[in-house]
Interface confidence: low
C-alpha cells in the first residue's frame, strides 16, 4: 500500500520522491500524476520534467522545490485543498521498457485543526497511523510509534512541522 | 545459442480463447524480460505484451489490454501468452522475442493464430 | 506513443549498389546517461521471422555481414547496405526499445533492380 503525508488545507504538502543521476548531470524524464502509475507514463500528469528541465505543469501550484539537477524531484503542492486528496505517481522515466522507478505515495488533506481532540481520539489516530515527522527536505528527523508518541495534540504536531519547515505541514505514515 | 519455440497457435472462432506457450533454451531465462509480438498476414510488426525477468511487471499494448495476459514460469523457463474475447484482427503469426528490457530481441519462428468463423 | 517512420517504402536497387533506408522516430530514442540510442534494425525474408542486424543504432550483431550499417542519433537514423547482394532481398524494420509500446516502423521492401 500507498506511504501516506498528511497535510492541512492552505497548507503545502510535500511528496518525497527522488532518484540517482548516474553520472551526476545526466537527468532523465519524471512525470507526477495523480492517481495510481498506470502501465504506461503518468495519468492525469501534473508536472513533467525532461532531460532538462519542468516542462509541463498544470498549476502553478505544483513544483519541485528540491535539487531537481541531482535528482530531487519531490513534489510540492501549494495551498492545498481537500480536493488534492488522493494518490499520487511519481515515475522516473529510464529508458528500456522494464526499467521505470514508479512511487505511488497518498495524500490526505485535513481541514484545520480547531480545537485540541479529545485523548481517545489522539490515541485512534495514533494507532491507526504510526507517524514518522518529516522536518525537511531529507527525510524523517525522528521516528515515532504509537507507544513512544510524545502526549502532544494535533494541533501541536501541525504547528510543530509549520516552524520546521516551510513547505508545510507534512506527515508519512509508514 | 537461442532457441525460442512458440506452441500452442491454430484456428479459433471469435471470441475463443488460446494459450500460448514459448520454450526457451540456450540462455538464463530467468534473467531477461520477455515479450511477443504479433504480424498480421502481409502486414508490420506490432508489439503485443512484455514480462519482466521475475514476472513482477507485465505490460500489453492497448489494442489486447484486458484480453490478453503475459506469464511466465521461470522453472520451466517458458514464456506464455493466455488469449481471451479472439477478434479476427489478432489473427497472426506470434513471435516470441527475448528481453525489449534494455537491448533489442531475438525472436522465435512464430506460430500462427488464426481467428475466424 | 513514440511512432517511427520509415522511407521510402520500396527500394530497388542494382546488385553492387547501394542500398539507404531512413528512419525516423517522433522523439529521441537517445538516453544520454549511456550515451545510447535504443534503436534496432531487423531484417524479415518470407516466411521467417525477423532477423537483427544493428542494435543501439550502429553495432552490428554477430555474424551480420558488414556491407550492413547502421547510423544516426536521437531522430533520425539510417540502415546502409553498402553493396547488395541477392541475398539481401528483404523487408527491413527500425523498431525503438526506448520506451512502452515498443513501436516498429512499417518496413521497407527493398529488391532488385
Known amino acids: 500500500s500507498e506511504v501516506e503525508y498528511i497535510a492541512e488545507v492552505g497548507q503545502n504538502a510535500y511528496l518525497p520522491c527522488s532518484y540517482t543521476p548516474a553520472p551526476p548531470g545526466n537527468l532523465v524524464p519524471v512525470c507526477w500524476g495523480k492517481g495510481a502509475c498506470p502501465v504506461f507514463d503518468c495519468s492525469n500528469v501534473v508536472l513533467r520534467t525532461d532531460n532538462r528541465d519542468v516542462n509541463d505543469r498544470t498549476s502553478g501550484r505544483y513544483w519541485l522545490k528540491g535539487d531537481f539537477h541531482k535528482g530531487d524531484v519531490s513534489l510540492t503542492i501549494e495551498n492545498v485543498t481537500l480536493a488534492d486528496s488522493g494518490v499520487y505517481c511519481c515515475r522516473i522515466q529510464i529508458p528500456g521498457i522494464m526499467n521505470d522507478e514508479k512511487h505511488n505515495v497518498k495524500l490526505v488533506v485535513i481541514k484545520p485543526a480547531k480545537v485540541t481532540p479529545a485523548p481517545t481520539l489522539q490515541r485512534d489516530l495514533t494507532s491507526a497511523f504510526p507517524r514518522m515527522l518529516t522536518t525537511g527536505e531529507h527525510g524523517p528527523a525522528e521516528t515515532q510509534t504509537p507507544g513512544s508518541l510524545p502526549d502532544v495534540n494535533l494541533t501541536q504536531i501541525f504547528t510543530l512541522t509549520n516552524e520546521l519547515r516551510d513547505s508545510g505541514a507534512t506527515i508519512r505514515t509508514a | 545459442e537461442v532457441q525460442l519455440l512458440e506452441a500452442g497457435g491454430g484456428p479459433v472462432q471469435p471470441g475463443g480463447s488460446l494459450r500460448l506457450s514459448c520454450a526457451a533454451a540456450?540462455?538464463?531465462?530467468?534473467?531477461?524480460?520477455m515479450s511477443w509480438v504479433r504480424q498480421a498476414p502481409g502486414k508490420g510488426l506490432e508489439w503485443v505484451s512484455s514480462?519482466?525477468?521475475?514476472?513482477?511487471?507485465?505490460y500489453h499494448a492497448d489494442s489486447v489490454q484486458g484480453r490478453f495476459t503475459i506469464s511466465r514460469d521461470n522453472s520451466k523457463s517458458t514464456l506464455y501468452l493466455q488469449m481471451n474475447s479472439l477478434r479476427a484482427e489478432d489473427t497472426a503469426v506470434y513471435y516470441c522475442?527475448?528481453?525489449?528490457?534494455?537491448?533489442?530481441?531475438?525472436w522465435g519462428q512464430g506460430t500462427l493464430v488464426t481467428v475466424s468463423s | 506513443d513514440i511512432v517511427m517512420t520509415q522511407s521510402p517504402d520500396s527500394l530497388a536497387v542494382s546488385l553492387g549498389e547501394r542500398a539507404t533506408i531512413n528512419c525516423k522516430s517522433s522523439?529521441?530514442?537517445?538516453?544520454?546517461?549511456?550515451?545510447?540510442?535504443?534503436l534496432a534494425w531487423y531484417q524479415q525474408k518470407p516466411g521467417q521471422p525477423p532477423k537483427l542486424l544493428i542494435y543501439w543504432a550502429s553495432t552490428r550483431e554477430s555474424g551480420v555481414p558488414d556491407r550492413f550499417s547502421g547510423s544516426g542519433s536521437g531522430t533520425d537514423f539510417t540502415l546502409t547496405i553498402s553493396s547488395l547482394q541477392a541475398e539481401d532481398v528483404a523487408v527491413y524494420y527500425c523498431q525503438q526499445y526506448y520506451s512502452s509500446p515498443l513501436t516498429f516502423g512499417g518496413g521497407t521492401k527493398v529488391e532488385i533492380k
Open positions: 514480462i519482466s525477468d521475475n514476472g513482477g511487471t507485465a
Open positions: 522523439q529521441s530514442v537517445l538516453y544520454s546517461f549511456k550515451n545510447k540510442n535504443y
Open positions: 522475442a527475448k528481453d525489449f528490457g534494455d537491448s533489442p530481441g531475438y
Open positions: 540456450g540462455f538464463t531465462f530467468s534473467n531477461y524480460a
